[in-house]
């Protein structure tokens, strides 16, 4: 792959924030935005937020979706607004699971 050596400083993006880590805020600022879905005690837990540290996002976003967790990442202001992470189940739902948005 061609090594272009970008000289620009990392840009900060505004991201939608939903979940316990957001406190009372509905947005956050970071180098990447994310939307995640995980299964916790039988619930589908949806979260959105930002990675302040680019490398943290880079590593987290590398992780392939599993039956218990999926993360989708993007760069751009509010880019995670219309992203909903999906588990790799090809349309099948897990027995005994419910949708649950962490607000």
């Amino acid at each position: 792959m061609e090594d272009e050596k970008p000289k620009v400083n990392p840009k900060l993006y505004m991201c939608v924030c939903e979940g316990l880590s957001c406190g009372n805020e509905d947005h956050c600022e970071g180098q990447q935005c994310f939307s995640s879905l995980s299964i916790n005690d039988g619930f589908h837990v949806y979260q959105k937020g930002c990675f302040q540290v680019y490398e943290q996002g880079k590593m987290t976003c590398k992780t392939p979706p599993s039956p218990g967790q999926a993360v989708e990442c993007c760069q751009g202001d509010w880019c995670n607004r219309n992203i909903t992470a999906q588990l790799p189940t090809k349309g099948k739902s897990f027995p005994g699971t419910q949708n649950f948005h962490l607000e």
């Epitope: 792959m1 090594d3 050596k5 990392p10 302040q52 540290v53 680019y54 490398e55 943290q56 880079k58 590593m59 987290t60 590398k62 992780t63």
Partner: antibody, heavy 119, light 107 residues
């Protein structure tokens, strides 16, 4: 067991280039960011940059932007550091290191490669 | 670039004593700080990550504290193998930068 095996010491002429290697075992480099760090004799540590071997993305410290090129070959599980237009200031030990999502820091380090620039 | 100012540059101490090093960041870095130990002729070894968390296998006499711009690293009850150089590193914003190091010598 995770290991990073670096290539042997290099003695190079001023103005020349050198390529150092870092071969990983015990993990797939595609699952990590591979970093390089410089340490001059009796001095501190300087971060050079990283590569994501999965997609080839790189980040460099400004001081090394025109000096260093980091590459990786996933089939051989190896990361490389190429240093160009060498001067005595480039004489140092160069370490590769693995950045993991367990600690979000450089958890494992190679043993280092000594580069001596001399005519 | 974020500057990391580490102090002291060197310190002498005796076996069994406690020592504390400080690292100051030129801007806030949250808890994105690591501490490494390096012995002569060896590569650095991770001791502390996320400013306060102990890496696996690291003895509990090592500890880290702080957030934002001021961080501390403590070794309680010094052992012979602890005499080495120690470096802090910020991992918040590239270029990641190290402190200048602290060389801990036996008194």
């Amino acid at each position: 067991e995770v290991q990073l095996q670096q290539s042997g010491a290099e003695l190079v002429r001023p103005g020349a280039s050198v390529r150092l290697s870092c071969t990983a075992s015990g993990f797939n480099i595609k699952d990590s960011l591979m970093h390089w760090v410089k340490q001059r004799p009796e001095q501190g540590l300087e971060w050079i940059g990283w590569i994501d071997p999965e997609d080839g993305e790189t980040r460099y410290a400004p001081n090394f932007q025109d000096k260093a090129t980091i590459t990786a070959v996933t089939s051989s599980n190896t990361a490389y550091l190429q240093l160009s237009s060498l001067t005595s200031e480039d004489s140092a030990i160069y370490y590769c290191a693995r950045y993991t999502s367990r600690y979000y820091t450089m958890e494992y380090w190679g043993q280092g490669t000594s580069v001596t620039v001399s005519s | 670039d974020i500057q990391m100012t580490q102090s002291p540059a060197s310190q002498s101490a005796s076996l069994g004593e406690s020592v504390t090093f400080t690292c100051l960041a030129s801007q806030t870095i949250g808890t994105w700080l690591a501490w490494y130990q390096q012995k002569p002729g060896k590569s650095p070894q991770l001791l502390i990550y996320a400013a306060t968390s102990l890496a696996d296998g690291v003895p509990s006499r090592f500890s880290g504290s702080g957030s934002g711009t001021k961080f501390s690293f403590k070794i309680s009850s010094l052992q012979a193998e602890d005499f080495a150089s120690y470096y802090c590193q910020q991992l918040y914003w590239t270029p990641w930068t190290f402190g200048g190091g602290t060389k801990l010598e036996i008194k």
